[in-house]
């Protein structure tokens, strides 16, 4: 058993039929010694009586919020969660597995540049009594300070016959330096808490492996004299690291026609302009990565031909 | 370049921006075998890392390029050495299409550049390497890779800002 | 081509030292580490140790330890194998071969200790 | 070090006939095991590596199988010049050890 927060513990459960489970001794925080009864949840029900309380925890039932009284007044209050382990593994029920980029990758991240600031994201299918607590830090044995948000709910879908919950949180390295080359991992862990079940995830990875740009801005066409060619030009994102001669992109600019099996013409350059031919009812889209190291790409940003 | 001399800016934007292609383009083919993480070992004592305090940052090398020059240089040695060494040179052979051979020698072409015959920086950080087990190469073949790509990429963008901003 | 070619037999006396060379063409000599296999006559394979001519670094079966000296000249792409205080258990066939996992062999030197 | 040991010592067969040679490692060594064979009078020729991958200019009647401990050498229809001594040989870690041999005969 450990303590997750004030008056919050975790019991930690070896789940299989007919488990021993764990016994657990609480202690009611008052300096009074006698006349103490003990009640779980809103049953008046007396389990118990004295300063501590020994009981087996060994299933849902047993969790709880247990609460120490005298002569009618509330003393104290602790509430006990399970973090259920089978067959060695600890229990991934509370998050969806997003399988990309691989198996069993519940929490994904993404950063729109080097300075530090990144966002990750992870989804359910369950809609109340959820709680969610996320730390952080660069690296394990000596951490370096990473300041995490309030996780909040981003978006809703429907998925089939059921519906899907993301949600997300901002975190930002307390002292990001863009430039450096990073050594030790970001570490986030998530702390997940649904009705009486405590899980916990965890993700590692460096700034430079979750680096996604923003698209290219103000993507534009300009049509070159008696040719087919148009000249495409764009601009760095806005979110981009600067200065840019030291935070490179490279694009890739595409010329797509309107049914998507037609042959889609590809162009990679380290410029923000390119020549292309312009085929009617075509659309041309641009998109950017870093330049020297090969993290994703860009979403694309698009314009017409026409 | 040791003495406060300027590397030759643009030679050196140019190999260091084929070194990034080639840490990427030799990642997937480092052996015949599938790789299997057979345990965790570190890839090597110290790899040297461009750090914050290492004046790589454009403020750092506006100020002085030599420390940042002198870092990179170390760890293009150090590269350029295990990349050498058994780990690669030795079973399970490299596929035949694998680039790692033209990546050594351009690891030791930009180093050169850095450090003309007969211009000395002080003492270079040498990989302690215990001689690796055959079934241990793939994972630190893996590892060393990674690492390198995320050093050129650091190395990469120096060069490009120097030879935007300080060639002269 | 990849091909790998080694010096001629050698009569040498008991207690006297004998230095073989495996010349090596095809290929970057630095590219590769070189091995030493044992073979005595009419009996099975045995592994010498290797030498990686990039640094010279050597890998030796302990059993070889103090007998075999491995060495290479990068500029002549020549390995060597240098076996000292000689006795009649040494008579045998010494094959090089680059990297272990690949068809390279040399033909094999014969060596014949004898008074 | 690895053990490595050989069975048959001996096979005698009749061209055509499916063979399997048989090689088992002291220790697991995954799939780190090569196959060689040696006709009289020659260097050794490598015909399987990493357990089951061919070699180029190798016959398709030989293939390899196994893991671990456990590796076969099939040869799927065996020709009068499949004679020799067949080593098998732990690729897997230091001191790197063959298998004493096993020596196809026709018949």
């Known amino acids: 058993i450990w303590e997750l927060k004030k008056d919050v513990y975790v019991v930690e459960l070896d789940w299989y039929p007919d488990a021993p489970g764990e016994m657990v001794v609480l202690t009611c925080d008052t300096p009074e010694e006698d006349g103490i009864t003990w009640t779980l949840d809103q049953s008046s029900e007396v389990l118990g009586s004295g300063k501590t309380l020994t009981i087996q925890v060994k299933e849902f039932g047993d969790a709880g919020q247990y609460t120490c009284h005298k002569g009618g007044e509330v003393l104290s209050h602790s509430l006990l969660l399970l973090h259920k382990k089978e067959d060695g593994i600890w229990s991934t029920d509370i998050l969806k597995d997003q399988k990309e980029p691989k198996n069993k990758t519940f929490l994904r991240c993404e950063a729109k540049n080097y300075s530090g600031r990144f966002t990750c994201w992870w989804l359910t299918t369950i809609s109340t009594d959820l709680t969610f607590s996320v730390k952080s830090s660069r690296g394990s044995s000596d951490p370096q300070g990473v300041t995490c948000g309030a996780a909040t709910l981003s978006a809703e879908r429907v998925r089939g016959d059921n519906k899907e919950y993301e949600y997300s949180v901002e975190c930002q390295e307390d002292s990001a330096c863009p430039a450096a080359e990073e050594s030790l991992p970001i570490e986030v862990m998530v702390d997940a808490v649904h009705k009486l079940k405590y899980e916990n995830y965890t993700s590692s990875f460096f700034i430079r492996d979750i680096i996604k740009p923003d698209p290219p801005k103000n993507l534009q066409l300009k049509p070159l004299k008696n040719s087919r060619q148009v000249e495409v030009s764009w601009e760095y994102p806005d979110t981009w690291s600067t200065p840019h001669s030291y935070f490179s992109l490279t694009f890739c600019v595409q010329v797509q026609g309107k049914s998507k099996r037609e042959k889609k013409d590809r162009v990679f350059t380290d410029k923000t302009s390119a020549t292309v031919i312009c085929r009617k009812n075509a659309s041309i889209s641009v998109r950017a990565q870093d330049r020297y190291y090969s993290s994703s790409w860009s979403e694309w940003a698009s314009v017409p031909c026409s | 370049v040791p003495g406060g001399s300027s590397p030759a800016w643009t030679q050196c934007q140019q190999l260091s921006q084929k070194l990034c292609t080639l840490a990427w383009s030799a990642h997937p083919l480092v052996g015949h075998m599938d790789l299997r993480e057979e345990g965790d070992e570190e890839t090597t004592n110290d790899v040297p890392h461009i750090q914050c305090g290492d004046g790589c940052d454009p403020q750092g090398l506006r100020d002085n390029s030599q420390f940042c020059l002198q870092r990179i240089h170390q760890g293009l040695i150090f590269y350029e050495k295990l990349l050498g060494s058994d780990i690669f040179t030795g079973e399970p052979s490299l596929l035949p299409d694998s680039p790692v051979g033209q990546l050594h020698a351009s690891l030791l072409g930009l180093s050169q550049l850095l450090q003309p015959e007969g211009h000395h920086w002080e003492t270079q950080q040498i990989p302690s390497l215990s001689p690796s087990q055959p079934w241990q190469r793939l994972l630190l073949r893996f590892k060393i890779l990674r690492s390198l790509q995320a050093f050129v990429a650091v190395a990469a963008r120096v060069f490009a800002h120097g030879a935007a901003t300080l060639s002269p | 081509e990849v091909q790998l070619q080694q010096s001629g037999p050698e009569l040498v006396k008991p207690g006297a030292s004998v230095k073989m060379s495996c010349k090596a063409s095809?290929?970057?000599?630095?590219?590769?580490?070189m091995h030493w296999v044992k073979q005595k006559a009419g009996q099975g394979l045995e592994w010498i140790g290797y030498?990686?001519?990039?640094?010279?670094?050597?890998q030796y079966n302990e059993k070889f330890k103090g007998k075999a000296t491995l060495t290479s000249d990068k500029f002549s792409s020549t390995a060597y194998m240098e076996l000292s205080s000689l006795t009649s258990e040494d008579s045998a066939v010494y094959y090089c071969?680059?990297?272990?996992?690949?068809?390279?062999w040399g033909q094999g030197t014969l060596v014949t200790v004898s008074a | 070090d690895i053990v490595m040991t050989q069975s048959p010592a001996t096979l005698s067969v009749t061209p055509g006939d499916r063979v399997s040679l048989s090689c088992r490692a002291s220790?697991?060594?995954?799939?780190?095991l090569h196959w060689y064979q040696q006709k009289s009078h020659e260097s050794p020729r490598l015909l399987i590596k990493?357990?089951?991958q061919s070699i180029s200019g190798i016959p398709s009647r030989f293939s390899g199988s196994g893991s671990g401990s456990d590796f076969t050498l099939s040869i799927n229809s065996v020709e009068p010049e499949d004679v020799g001594v067949y080593y098998c040989?732990?690729?897997?870690?230091?001191?790197?050890?063959f298998g004493s041999g096993t020596k196809l005969e026709i018949k």
């Open positions: 071969t680059r990297r272990l996992d690949e068809a390279y």
């Open positions: 095809g290929y970057t000599f630095t590219s590769s580490v």
């Open positions: 030498i990686n001519p990039y640094n010279d670094g050597t």
């Open positions: 220790q697991s060594i995954s799939e780190y």
């Open positions: 990493y357990a089951s």
């Open positions: 040989q732990n690729g897997h870690s230091f001191p790197f050890t």
